[in-house]
């Protein structure tokens, strides 16, 4: 502890410029005073001044005002420091002496005599109020005033809280008049060293170095630190915790960048064909009559499909077609004939069989020809039975589709996994994505197909965190942290209780 | 009972950059009442105080080093750096790391043993 | 900058009080730690806050400041004491350290 117990010395009387043995002062009583501050005693004694002492020069002859003083000598009030908790109890000696000799130090000088003592005990506590007294005896009279105060930095009842006002970043506060630290705006904690964060910004996700700031933490974005970062590279995908990649409805794969409903995104058949998605970026698109091509953006000659029957020749018409009919037959398509079984209309050794009475025929064909007089081979491809681009071709009495490259299938209908071809070697884990197969390698080896083996191997130093499995060879120089269940990040460092997560591209 | 200890380099040479780290064992850097400090000690002479940083990256320097220093920290491995750019042959000190307590109003209550770095071609 | 001058040296007899002073403009309003150095070995605070001893630390240290100057006392000192001691500063961010007094 540490304070200051002030006296203020006001007025001293002493009309007859007597002493205390009842001699006069010749020529008159030149006074100066000795304080002596001691612990409380019932009854005062002798002994050392155990709260300190002062004397004064020589303040005036007989009666005299004292004035105040703020400093040098004759410093009124005088100051008795101390260096311990106030007890809030005191004994305090003044005695009033005269002096025949020097006027600044009289302590020093020999035959200096008594006037008058007064001598104070009692309780003070600490304050700014001054206790204002007045001690008479038979010569002489002192009017006086005293408090204790505390020295700077120091607070409380006692004095005994030492407090200074700091604003660094151990703290940032001021002093309370009981000696409690009072935070500046923006700053809490027990030492005012922490900072009040940007209202709103997550408790967890975000923290701050200084007052109204919102830091992220790693996964964390947005100005309050409460939108999670998704996966890197997700594209068409959310997350709910960080570094997670939920796909958007239609989309798949690691990245939700493989289109699982390409026909609803991106509308690839033309002329109002049916479209059917089948698998990542895969679709077939079905053509209506009069159209063929992969996207059935290829208009038909409206003879294409053979309209004219019997033999009859087709002929293209702005939006139409004419049949011209051979003899014996007529109709839009040369459908009705006039000729019977008499007339042998059946070609490619067909058999006529006579109908209505014999008015009209009809031909029986042999295998691979058609047509109402078997006048027609069979071409088994006119019904573009191929889809996915496969080309159709003829084999005798059959057909077959050739496939474009990742369709198989009798009609080239499926769509060939790219990781099928198990294109890893050394043990590569293959993925499917929208540019061909990606392969993650084991530690050692790299390269597109994992085909490179490595001096140097970025899995040796053990980068990944929590237990994962490192890879090698997503990208040249990289590895690939497997994180366990519940941690994430680029070496699977931060435990967040998620689901287990896909590989991270360290 | 908390421990620091320094590792790096014991050479350096002119020009190039000086790197330190600090491990922390026995108690958590991420504890908010402390700030994790470099100080430095030519041979012969006084303590430098250099800088330090608190758990979530605030760093707080000496201006006259300002320039030069960087600090860093890495709470998943319990470690604090220091990296010194361009040095020459007065950087030649041990250094120490300390933490301070914000309880201690910044007093230094734990330091680790010092390494001792010498600038030199 | 801010600065803080210590003796270079300060004598004393076993048993007796030793006094190391430590002064700086308006040093009585900053908070003063005080270190104590051994050869060869790092710096052990002694005092903090001025005045305050940590666990561990004799009550034969003390420690006061006010106006410009703070004071580290060791009194009943013991040839175990004989050290270099340093006072320590926060001026605004900066950590500042006194020049080190040898006690002998």
């Known amino acids: 502890g540490s304070g200051i117990f002030q006296l203020r010395l006001q007025e001293f009387v002493n009309q007859r410029g007597m002493l205390a043995n009842g001699q006069s002062c010749e020529p008159g009583c030149r006074t100066f005073f000795r304080i002596c501050l001691k612990h409380f005693q019932a009854t005062f004694s002798e002994g050392p001044c155990t709260f300190g002492n002062v004397s004064t020069p020589v303040l005036g002859t007989n009666s005299f005002v004292v004035r105040d003083k703020n400093s040098g000598s004759g410093r009124n009030p005088l100051q008795l420091p101390f260096n311990f908790t106030w007890p809030g109890t005191f004994s305090l000696n003044i005695q009033a002496w005269h002096t025949p000799g020097d006027d600044l130090r009289p302590e020093t000088s020999p035959g200096n005599s008594l006037i008058s003592q007064i001598i104070i005990q009692g309780s003070l506590a600490v304050g700014k109020i001054w206790r204002t007294d007045e001690q008479n005896d038979t010569l002489t009279r002192l009017s006086y005033s005293y408090r204790v105060i505390c020295s700077d930095n120091y607070y409380g009842e006692s004095c005994s809280r030492l407090c200074k006002k700091r604003d660094d970043h151990f703290g940032h506060y001021e002093c309370q008049p009981d000696g409690s630290l009072s935070c500046l705006p923006g700053w809490t904690g027990k030492y005012c060293d922490q900072p009040i964060c940007l209202s709103g910004c997550h408790e967890q996700n975000g923290y701050c170095s200084k007052p109204d700031e919102c830091i992220c933490r790693p996964g964390w974005q947005g100005r309050l630190c409460n939108e999670c970062i998704p996966h890197n590279g997700c594209r068409h995908g959310t997350c709910s915790i960080p570094w997670q990649c939920a796909c958007d409805e239609g989309w798949g794969g690691l990245f939700c960048d493989q289109d699982l409903n390409y026909c609803t995104h991106h509308s690839p058949c033309k002329n109002g064909s049916t479209c059917s998605n089948s698998g990542p970026k895969g679709y077939t698109c079905t053509c209506l009559p009069g159209y063929t091509g992969e996207h059935c953006e290829l208009g038909l000659s409206k003879c294409a499909s053979n309209p004219c029957r019997n033999g009859g020749s087709c002929k293209d018409q702005e939006n139409s077609y004419h049949c011209l009919c051979p003899p014996g037959y007529y109709g839009q398509h040369c459908e009705h004939s006039t000729l019977t079984c008499a007339d042998s209309p059946c070609f490619n050794g067909g058999s006529c069989r006579e109908r209505n009475q014999g008015s009209s025929y009809a031909c029986e064909c042999p295998p691979n020809f058609t047509g109402s007089n078997c006048e027609k081979k069979v071409d088994r491809c006119t019904s573009n039975p191929c889809a996915n681009g496969g080309q159709c071709q003829n084999r005798g009495p059959s057909r077959t589709c050739r496939c474009r490259p990742g369709f198989t299938g009798t009609h080239c209908e499926l769509h060939i996994s790219d990781c099928a071809r198990s294109p890893c070697a050394h043990g590569g884990t293959c993925h499917d994505l929208e540019n061909g197969p990606v392969c993650t390698c084991p530690a050692g080896f790299s390269g597109r197909r994992c085909e490179v083996r490595i001096t140097h191997d970025a899995c040796a130093s053990g980068p990944c965190f929590n237990g994962a499995t490192c890879y090698t060879g997503l990208s040249p120089n990289n590895f690939v942290c497997n994180c366990p269940y519940g941690f994430v990040g680029s070496r699977c460092e931060f435990p967040v209780g998620l689901p287990p997560s896909f590989p991270w591209v360290a | 009972e908390v421990q620091l200890q320094e590792s790096g380099p014991g050479l350096v040479k002119p020009s190039e950059t000086l790197s330190l780290t600090c491990t922390v064992s026995?108690?958590?850097?991420?504890?908010?009442?402390?700030?994790w400090g470099w100080i430095r000690q030519p041979p012969g002479k006084g303590l430098e105080w250099i800088g330090d940083?608190?758990?979530?990256?605030?760093?707080y320097y000496n201006p006259s080093l300002k320039s030069r220093v960087t600090i860093s920290v890495d709470t998943s491995k319990n470690q604090f750096s220091l990296k010194l750019s361009s040095v020459t042959a007065a950087d030649t000190a041990v250094y120490y790391c300390?933490?301070?307590?914000?309880?201690?109003?910044?007093?230094?209550?734990?330091w680790g043993q010092g390494t001792l770095v010498t600038v030199s071609s | 900058s801010y600065e803080l001058t210590q003796p270079p040296s300060v004598s004393v007899s076993p048993g007796q009080t030793a006094s190391i002073t430590c002064s700086g403009d308006?040093?009585?309003?900053?908070?003063v730690s005080w270190y104590q150095q051994k050869p060869g070995q790092s710096p052990v605070l002694v005092i903090y806050?001025?005045?305050e001893r940590p666990s561990g630390i004799p009550e034969r240290f003390s420690g006061s400041n006010s106006g410009d100057t703070a004071t580290l006392t060791i009194s009943g000192t013991q040839a175990m004491d004989e050290a270099d001691y340093y006072c320590?500063?926060?001026?605004?961010?900066?950590?500042?350290f006194g020049s080190g007094t040898k006690v002998t």
């Open positions: 320590q500063a926060w001026d605004s961010e900066t950590g500042v």
């Open positions: 806050e001025d005045s």
């Open positions: 308006s040093l009585g309003d900053k908070y």
């Open positions: 300390a933490r301070q307590a914000v309880m201690y109003g910044g007093g230094s209550d734990n």
């Open positions: 940083i608190y758990y979530t990256g605030s760093t």
């Open positions: 026995g108690g958590s850097i991420s504890s908010g009442s402390y700030y």
